[in-house]
Interface confidence: low
């Protein structure tokens, strides 16, 4: 019968011919009367056999990630008779792994959005690297994740690649962060290969800023000929938040004369001062009103940021019109 051990050949061997093992018949007494032949994919090109001894050699550099095993057939023939000594047999040559592939992040680019002021431990995103080496071969494909850039705001779980918040962030100070994650194989041991990826983390806005008037005093004028409903001027507050969180409502806080109103232009986020009652220069030539501004939408949990609405004082001068 046939005699052989399991055949292994390391990938990426640089030698011109690498001895893999021997394939022989137990009828072979070593007097060179038998001839060994190799058949199948790779025979003659990748692998050769010594016809007299049955020694098998790899004559090409192999890449396990391209092909991890070869199935070949062996024949042994009695040279004198030309007849097969053993039935043709199939055998396997396995290509054994070396750590020649670095981890790769296949789902790049990574981008995540997380609300500003999120607490520590908040999940941001999970990054995953893959390694083409053999996961069953030692630690060649066992990965560990680490953070190269992003401290102190972010952390990464070493075995899962889960990125979490490690420090609260304020969108109004910085609205996006670039985090760089490294994946290292060989669980970080010597000879490890690594790959990196960048993650763009954007902070979404929460309503943590109240609108504040740009000026503590506004001066407007109104003609005594102006009809009721006339827009006599605008006041403006600013809000460091964005979008819906920056939408504001203006209102009168104090107007003893009941002469003016303020409506909100939600398009420009301005407060428009409206004449509610006609004015008469001879009757009163100036008015003082106090206005306030508040955000349109404030969730209950963010009310702590919105105590005491911002106010402003508006001096309104009446312009005289010559009467006939």
């Amino acid at each position: 019968g046939w005699v052989w051990n399991q055949f292994f050949v390391p990938e990426e061997m640089n030698t011109t011919s690498h001895h893999i093992g021997q394939l022989r018949s137990d009828l072979d007494n070593g007097n060179n009367s038998f001839q060994y032949k190799l058949l199948g994919a790779g025979a003659g090109s990748t692998f050769i056999i010594d016809e007299r001894t049955g020694d098998i050699y790899a004559i090409q550099k192999l890449d396990r990630e391209e092909r991890s095993l070869y199935i070949l057939r062996a024949q042994v023939i009695d040279i004198a008779t030309g007849r097969a000594v053993e039935p043709e047999s199939e055998f396997v040559i396995k290509v054994s792994d070396i750590n020649d592939n670095e981890p790769k992040f296949l789902d790049e680019p990574y981008e995540a959005i997380v609300p500003e002021m999120s607490p520590e431990g908040t999940l941001v995103i999970q990054v995953t690297a893959s390694d083409a080496d053999d996961p069953s071969s030692g630690n060649n494909a066992r990965l560990l994740y680490s953070l190269l850039q992003g401290q102190p705001y972010f952390s990464v779980e070493p075995t899962t690649g889960v990125i979490r918040i490690s420090s609260k962030m304020d969108r109004e100070l910085q609205d996006e962060y670039w985090v760089i994650i490294q994946a290292k194989d060989m669980i970080g041991q010597p000879g490890a290969l690594s790959g990196t990826t960048s993650v763009l983390i954007k902070l979404s806005d929460v309503n943590d800023n109240k609108p504040i008037f740009k000026e503590s005093l506004y001066r407007l004028t109104v003609s005594e000929s102006a009809p009721t409903g006339t827009s006599i001027g605008t006041i403006m507050a600013y809000d460091n938040d964005i979008g819906e969180n920056a939408e504001m409502d203006y209102s009168i806080e104090e107007d003893d004369s009941q002469t003016f109103d303020i409506i909100t232009n939600h398009e420009t986020q301005e407060g428009i001062v409206i004449l509610k009652k006609k004015v008469d220069f001879e009757h009163q030539n100036h008015y003082g009103i106090r206005a306030k501004v508040k955000n349109h939408h404030v969730p209950e949990q963010l009310m702590k940021y919105h105590t005491e609405a911002s106010t402003t004082f508006i001096k309104i001068q009446v312009e005289d019109v010559d009467e006939p």
Partner: antibody, heavy 119, light 107 residues
Framework: QVQLVESGGGVVQPGRSLRLSCAAS????????MHWVRQAPGKGLEWVAV????????YYADSVKGRFTISRDTSKNTLYLQMNSLRAEDTAVYYC????????????WGQGTLVSVSS | EIVLTQSPGTLSLSPGERATLSCRAS???????LAWYQQRPGQAPRLLIY???SRATGIPDRFSGSGSGTDFTLTISSLEPEDFAVYYC????????FGQGTKVEIK
């Protein structure tokens, strides 16, 4: 950066129609009122029409009222001017312009597109 | 509508000189809602001044605006070669109207 690019101009016969487009980029289109302004060859600027940020309000110069229609498509970040019953006096370079957020002046303008109404 | 009249029609000056452009409104422009634009040949207008006196982003401080009510002024303190252009005033107190323009040319 903010960019406004007009297109759709050309030579057209009196009484015919033309639609101008203005592709906006580099800003939140849906937050701004947008305008069309024209300039006849060798002449000054003439305001034509405005549309509010949400498309609910339009306002026209008397010279084009009833013939021109301003519209916008927020999903395409594009402003339009549909010009019907064109006259020789409508010949001009047409600019789209963005209205300042906290003001009513025009902070960004396109490069313009020429409309020639001629038989 | 508010009619804006600019003067002079043409201003012939040399680089380094001071330019003073006037814009008069047919009625009072409330809240100084007046802007100034520069238009170079073959180009679109560019916002210089809004609110009568506020410089737009990126505009050099040699440009200044002043005035209120019906009389407004654009001043260029020292003309640079690139300042020779047509200047328009615009009111946006009541709809939008432009002046007829003032051409600043090299003498």
């Amino acid at each position: 950066q903010v960019q406004l690019v007009e297109s759709g101009g050309g030579v057209v016969q009196p009484g015919r129609s033309l639609r101008l487009s203005c592709a906006a980029s580099g800003f939140t289109f849906s937050s701004y009122d947008m305008h069309w302004v024209r300039q006849a060859p060798g002449k000054g600027l003439e305001w034509v029409a405005v549309i509010s940020y949400d498309g609910t309000n339009e306002y026209y110069a008397d010279s084009v009222k009833g013939r021109f229609t301003i519209s916008r498509d927020t999903s395409k970040n594009t402003l339009y001017l549909q010009m019907n019953s064109l006259r020789a006096e409508d010949t001009a370079v047409y600019y789209c312009a963005r209205e300042r957020y906290f003001d009513w002046s025009f902070d960004y303008w396109g490069q313009g597109t020429l409309v020639s109404v001629s038989s | 509508e508010i009619v804006l009249t600019q003067s002079p029609g043409t201003l012939s000056l040399s680089p380094g000189e001071r330019a003073t452009l006037s814009c008069r409104a047919s009625q009072s422009v409330s809240n100084t809602y007046l802007a100034w634009y520069q238009q170079r040949p073959g180009q679109a207008p560019r916002l210089l001044i809004y609110g009568a006196s506020s410089r737009a982003t990126g505009i050099p401080d040699r440009f200044s605006g002043s005035g209120s009510g019906t009389d407004f002024t654009l001043t260029i303190s020292s003309l640079e070669p690139e300042d020779f252009a047509v200047y328009y005033c615009q009111q946006y107190s009541n709809s939008w109207t432009f002046g007829q323009g003032t051409k600043v040319e090299i003498k």
